[in-house]
């Protein structure tokens, strides 16, 4: 019997201080350019080595963010979101949805923390 | 398997052009950043041309300006360079590199070397 895959949705307040090289992340999304099917949704694609973001440590690849300094992120096409992030600030305040994977064992196994998978 | 594939290039006289291209396969490119880079012979790799994923702004190194055109297809899944009025100093080697996503960083100097994941194995471009 194949196990089933879960998700466990977390939602964070993230505080970065724009770097040197900036914010230090790229982004996926929008109601032009779905990542991710039947979601309009900004999404992280890619964290900057040494950047603020990788310095700070918890904003991760796969991360949907929802707002930026209380400005909600739907129904924005692509490269608005881009501007926005771009002349957000030097103090920028996201809050994110994170989304572990979980592997669930088949029903009956005891195994939910099981982070395999 | 990720793969980017140049071609295009050869052997052209000063004042001629070229038209390179850089075909992706096993991804999508509608979601990636993508540019031109070329090394010359005992000389650093550099960025010479990039677009980001929407096709809605590009770079452009001060050396090319007014000559060289970069391009995106998504439904070809290709990207070009179009390369006018050749001179010398443009013999290099020409790659595509992608990135996914584009940056919420300023400055179009976005076409770093160090911003992109994924690289092809280039096109010798030869003017003489």
């Known amino acids: 019997m194949n196990g089933r895959v879960d998700y466990l949705v977390t939602e964070e307040e993230i505080n970065l201080t724009r770097g040197p090289s900036g914010l230090g992340f790229n982004i996926v999304g929008g109601t032009d350019q779905q990542y991710v099917s039947n979601d309009s949704g900004i999404y992280v694609s890619r964290i900057k080595e040494n950047g603020a973001a990788a310095l700070d440590g918890r904003l991760q690849e796969g991360d949907k963010i929802l707002s930026v300094n209380g400005q909600d992120l739907k129904n924005l096409l692509h490269q608005d979101a881009v501007d926005l992030f771009r002349n957000a600030g030097y103090a920028v305040s996201l809050r994110v949805q994170h989304r572990l994977q979980v592997q669930n064992g088949p029903i009956g196994h005891r195994g939910e923390g099981d982070p395999s998978g | 398997e990720v793969q980017l594939v140049e071609s295009g290039g050869g052997l052209v006289q000063a004042g001629g052009s070229l038209r390179l291209s850089c075909a992706a396969s096993?991804?999508?490119?509608?979601?990636?950043?993508i540019g031109w880079f070329r090394q010359a012979p005992g000389k650093e790799r550099e960025g010479v041309s990039c677009?980001?994923?929407?096709?809605?702004?590009?770079f452009y190194a001060d050396s090319v300006k007014g000559r060289f055109t970069i391009s995106r297809d998504n439904a070809k899944n290709t990207l070009y360079l179009q390369m006018n009025s050749l001179k010398p100093e443009d013999t290099a080697v020409y790659y595509c590199?992608?990135?996914?996503?584009?940056?919420?960083?300023?400055?179009?100097?976005?076409?770093?070397?160090?911003?992109?994941?994924?690289w092809g194995q280039g096109t010798q471009v030869t003017v003489s």
């Open positions: 096993g991804f999508t490119l509608d979601y990636y950043g």
């Open positions: 677009i980001d994923s929407s096709g809605g702004s590009t």
């Open positions: 590199a992608a990135v996914l996503g584009d940056s919420v960083d300023y400055g179009m100097g976005y076409c770093n070397l160090d911003e992109y994941d994924y």
